[in-house]
Interface confidence: medium
């Protein structure tokens, strides 16, 4: 842990402490912005990214989008803050070791979203029905 | 018990160049994603460089990109960062410190530091 000599500074953008006292560095994500993607029903789909980028702050996570309309398919991976939202859209799932994909309301398209807070792991996005988190059983694995 | 001990600070000119080391025991230092942190005076922390557990990948904040290079001797337990072109702003207190588990970005254990003084 943080030695008790160590000063932590409230507004400093670049640490993050958790409550142990742990420092959070910057996550690692893909960030390949938007693409076109072959990734179409599927349980689960790699991002197919090349680009690790370590994030810009430490408090980023990593969120992926899947877009589907009547011209193409397209997956977005980036880094963002979840305190801001992204589309339009609240990153509730930030927490989440796993990018669990869920639809969100969008006219005109198939918009699916996710967010997940461990290293590159908006590399492998899941559709599942099995992995909703509505199951008990998941809960427990993913807070464990 | 996880020790980490820093050592290789000193007084330097703006411009020169220091080889920061630190020794690790106490965990498996080959598994482990490594990085390193400083405190400027009277300021708050400022993450550095981390360093994947084969030493292949590294990421660096933007104030240090293309003049610090931290790299790791797993065959040691020790990781390294080596500082060029330093400059007053880069005077402070640095400490080396270990990712708590694969796949995470919080950092748990650190050592004492060692402090670093740009100053001509």
């Known amino acids: 842990t943080i030695p008790p000599h160590v000063q932590k500074s409230v507004n400093n953008d670049m640490i993050v402490t958790d409550n142990n006292g742990a420092v959070k560095f910057p996550q690692l994500c893909k960030f390949c912005d938007v693409r076109f993607s072959t990734c179409d029903n599927q349980k689960s789909c790699m991002s197919n990214c090349s680009i690790t980028s370590i994030c810009e702050k430490p408090q980023e996570v990593c969120v992926a989008v899947w877009r589907k309309n009547d011209e193409n398919i397209t997956l977005e991976t980036v880094c963002h803050d979840p305190k801001l939202p992204y589309h339009d859209f609240i990153l509730e799932d930030a927490a989440s070791p796993k990018c669990i994909m869920k639809e969100k309301k969008k006219p005109g398209e198939t918009f699916f979203m996710c967010s997940c807070s461990s290293d590159e792991c908006n590399d492998n996005i899941i559709f599942s029905e099995e992995y909703n988190t509505s199951n008990p059983d998941l809960l427990l694995v993913i807070f464990q | 018990e996880v020790q980490l001990l820093e050592s290789g600070g000193g007084l330097v000119q703006p411009g020169g160049s220091l080889r920061l080391s630190c020794a690790a025991s106490?965990?498996?230092?080959?598994?482990?994603?490594m990085g390193w942190v400083r405190q400027a005076p009277g300021k708050g922390l400022e993450w550095v460089s981390r360093?994947?557990?084969?030493?292949?990948?590294?990421y660096y904040a933007d104030s240090v990109k293309g003049r610090f290079t931290i790299s790791r001797d797993n065959s040691k337990n020790t990781l390294y960062l080596q500082m060029n072109s330093l400059r007053a702003e880069d005077t402070a207190v640095y400490y080396c410190?270990?990712?708590?588990?694969?796949?995470?970005?919080?950092?748990?254990?650190w050592g004492q530091g060692t402090l670093v003084t740009v100053s001509s």
């Open positions: 410190a270990k990712q708590r588990e694969l796949g995470k970005s919080h950092f748990d254990y």
């Open positions: 106490g965990f498996t230092f080959e598994n482990t994603s």
């Open positions: 360093i994947d557990p084969k030493g292949s990948h590294t």
